[in-house]
């Protein structure tokens, strides 16, 4: 028998520095977690103790903190090189700055292979990007070889900016011939490493003949065997065992997100490359693990540029940006409108001639807006200003919901109106009318939404049975502020870009902003 240790991360999302337990900015260092310096300590400890070790990343290193905003992927290549990652799969967020924003900082600079079997280039891009990422990689490990085959969510064109010259094929259809090719090369130990979410990971384990292990990402899935060490609730045991269609037991793993855990999986293979056994658990990277001093020193060196960036002007406002709780928790506020407009703008993807855009709606809990911005400072808006408005380090995500769920959400928005509670919704692409004289749960008297399948956008009444795409904070997608109906009834959830980054990009693009209160949210009494 031959034993392989797979160390894995996914959805690190720019958390190069240690973070608090909830993966936001580290405040009390003695209780902070993760970060590349701490990760390196643990990886090196395992490399020294065990003979056959692979360090893999399942995508979405890009996007999530000011590190990515400033360094645009150069930080990913630099620190992943330093940690000696063995391979990485492309995630959807690796395309957030377009194909060029992937090629120059990451694909050309990475010392480790970057993989995806289901992304095919066409047109002029084909020759430019040829060979800069691979469908698979054969890695020598000890006296054996291991094949790693990559995959990426086929929803990427709706979630990021890959352009029109990359085709995202069905994962299973694309993986099978690459795995077959590895088999003909006598590679009999094959890991599928990719970024399509836990459901697809399980399907790959079930359907792709010859895949021995699946290491996934995208859905931030936490798996654990035994008592979990922190706040995350396991979605299943680690590894999650799938019985393939040809009768094999295939371990599937994922390691939550944000570099909080290091996935640790031990696989025992027989001489024919069959998995005999698999066991392990994610390792919580808490403060009991010291940060490696040399990596930490490098982080501190790179940090300097971030501090300078946060005080630079992004753009100007010529109006007061009212982010006060007195406004945003009670009525339409122009800060809410600004943020929602930025959220929609960030999700413009012309992927179909029938649609002017794939999504037109935004909702945003008023309690998530934490500060106004005064225009009487020469109108200057900085990252620092925006960090006061959006201090929680969240993301603006894409969900699919039925109209009936949205109606419940808007009822919840005003179910206890008047108490300055955070669930009051700010909106974009939505016109809502409330009648507060009616009983809670029956206060939405008009709810019109902006069409997407139209050449001239206009507002139509919400249809209860129709499925709509909506951009919203991850906080709401996860049921925060009492929006349990969103969490329970959402049909799809894809994590998006860092909240501050979305707004800062929009302000930089617009240069001068002047959001108004324009009648998106209205109140009425009496008959309709």
């Amino acid at each position: 028998a031959w034993e392989l240790t797979i160390l894995h991360t996914n959805d690190v999302h720019s958390r190069l520095e240690q973070t608090s337990e909830d993966s936001s900015k580290c405040v009390n260092a003695s209780r902070c977690m993760g970060g590349v310096a701490r990760l390196f300590t643990k990886v090196q400890q395992i490399r020294r103790a065990e003979p056959n070790v692979l360090l893999l990343d399942a995508g979405d290193q890009y996007q999530g903190t000011i590190w990515f905003t400033v360094y645009k992927g150069a930080e990913v290549a630099h620190f992943m090189n330093a940690l000696r990652y063995d391979a990485m799969a492309l995630g959807n967020h690796e395309f957030d700055n377009g194909v060029e924003g992937l090629i120059e900082p990451l694909l050309k600079e990475a010392k480790f292979p970057i993989l995806s079997a289901n992304i095919k280039a066409k047109g002029p891009l084909a020759s430019q990007i040829s060979g800069l990422y691979l469908p698979y990689k054969v890695l020598p490990v000890g006296d054996e070889v291991v094949g790693i085959v990559g995959y990426t969510s086929k929803e990427t064109p709706f979630l990021s900016n890959p352009g029109t010259n990359l085709v995202f094929e069905d994962e299973i259809t694309a993986l099978q011939p690459e795995v077959d090719k590895l088999k003909t090369l006598n590679v009999n130990k094959i890991i599928a490493l990719g970024h399509s979410g836990f459901e697809m990971d399980k399907l790959i384990a079930q359907k792709v003949r010859g895949v021995d292990v699946v290491v996934g990402g995208h859905s931030n899935t936490f798996l654990y065997t035994g008592n979990p060490p922190s706040k995350e609730v396991p979605a299943g045991k680690y590894p999650f065992i799938v019985t393939s269609d040809d009768g094999r037991k295939v371990p599937v793993v994922q390691a939550y997100a944000f570099g909080k855990y290091l996935g640790y999986l031990k696989i025992e293979f027989d001489e024919r490359g069959n998995v005999i056994s698999s066991h392990g658990n994610p390792i919580l990277l808490n403060s009991s693990i010291p940060e490696d001093p040399s990596i930490k020193a490098d982080i501190n060196k790179w940090r300097i540029k971030l501090d300078n960036y946060s005080t630079q002007e992004l753009g100007k406002t010529i109006v007061y940006l009212d982010g006060s709780s007195q406004s945003c928790r009670f009525r339409e506020c122009n800060m809410g409108n600004l943020i929602c407009d930025a959220m929609i703008n960030n999700n413009l993807r012309h992927t179909d001639e029938m649609f002017w855009n794939h999504v037109s709606m935004c909702i945003l809990n008023g309690g998530g807006i934490r500060s106004p911005i005064d225009e009487r400072n020469n109108g200057t808006i900085t990252w620092e200003n925006l960090a006061a408005v959006l201090p929680f380090g969240g993301t603006f995500d894409l969900v699919q919901l039925k109209g009936s769920t949205l109606k419940k959400a808007f009822e919840h928005s005003v179910h206890r109106y008047g108490q300055s509670t955070g669930e009051f919704l700010q909106v974009g692409g939505i016109h809502v009318v409330y009648d507060l004289s009616r009983k809670p749960g029956d206060r939405v008297v008009k709810l019109d939404v902006l069409c997407t399948k139209c050449r001239v956008p206009s507002y139509d009444p919400l249809k209860m049975d129709e499925v709509y795409k909506v951009i919203l904070p991850n906080f709401l997608a996860n049921g925060g502020d009492g929006f349990q109906m969103i969490k329970d009834e959402l049909l799809r959830h894809d994590s998006g870009d860092q909240d501050i980054n979305v707004v800062s990009t929009y302000i930089s693009k617009m240069k001068v902003i002047y959001p108004a209160v324009e009648g998106r949210i209205k109140f009425s009494t009496g008959s309709h």
Partner: nanobody, 126 residues
């Protein structure tokens, strides 16, 4: 676009020397362990020599040890194979290959190499 191209092959007498060159483009050559392989008519492609990314580690097939030397110049994006005391059995098409791997230990295994040149013919007459 990642491309690998060999040059420097030719027809030489037994006992002569030849220097093969390999240029890589599309990504810095410092990202790759590099290898030379050869294929004689009617035979399998075989490993000749390999060099680590930094150039600090080299590895040779037993049949060429002491006669062939692999080297690299990352600034020029080039890898070289200096061939001395050539024998008729060195006659083959010589291929340069690049292995994109975050390790400074070159491999003799053909299957770990990701990028291949078209090859350059070396003929050694007796």
């Amino acid at each position: 676009q990642v491309q690998v191209q060999e040059s420097g092959g030719g027809l030489v007498q037994a006992g002569d020397s030849l220097r093969l060159s390999c240029a890589a483009s599309g990504r810095s050559i410092s990202r790759y362990n590099m290898g030379w392989f050869r294929q004689a008519p009617g035979k399998e492609r075989e490993f000749v020599a390999a060099i680590s990314r930094s150039g600090g580690v080299t590895y040779y097939a037993d049949s060429v040890k002491g006669r062939l030397t692999i080297s690299r110049d990352n600034a020029k994006s080039a890898v070289y194979l200096q061939m001395n005391s050539l024998k008729p059995e060195d006659t083959a098409v010589y291929y340069c290959a690049a292995d994109w791997r975050n390790s400074d230990s070159p491999s003799p295994l053909i299957i770990v190499y990701d990028y291949w040149g078209q090859g350059t013919q070396v003929t050694v007459s007796s």
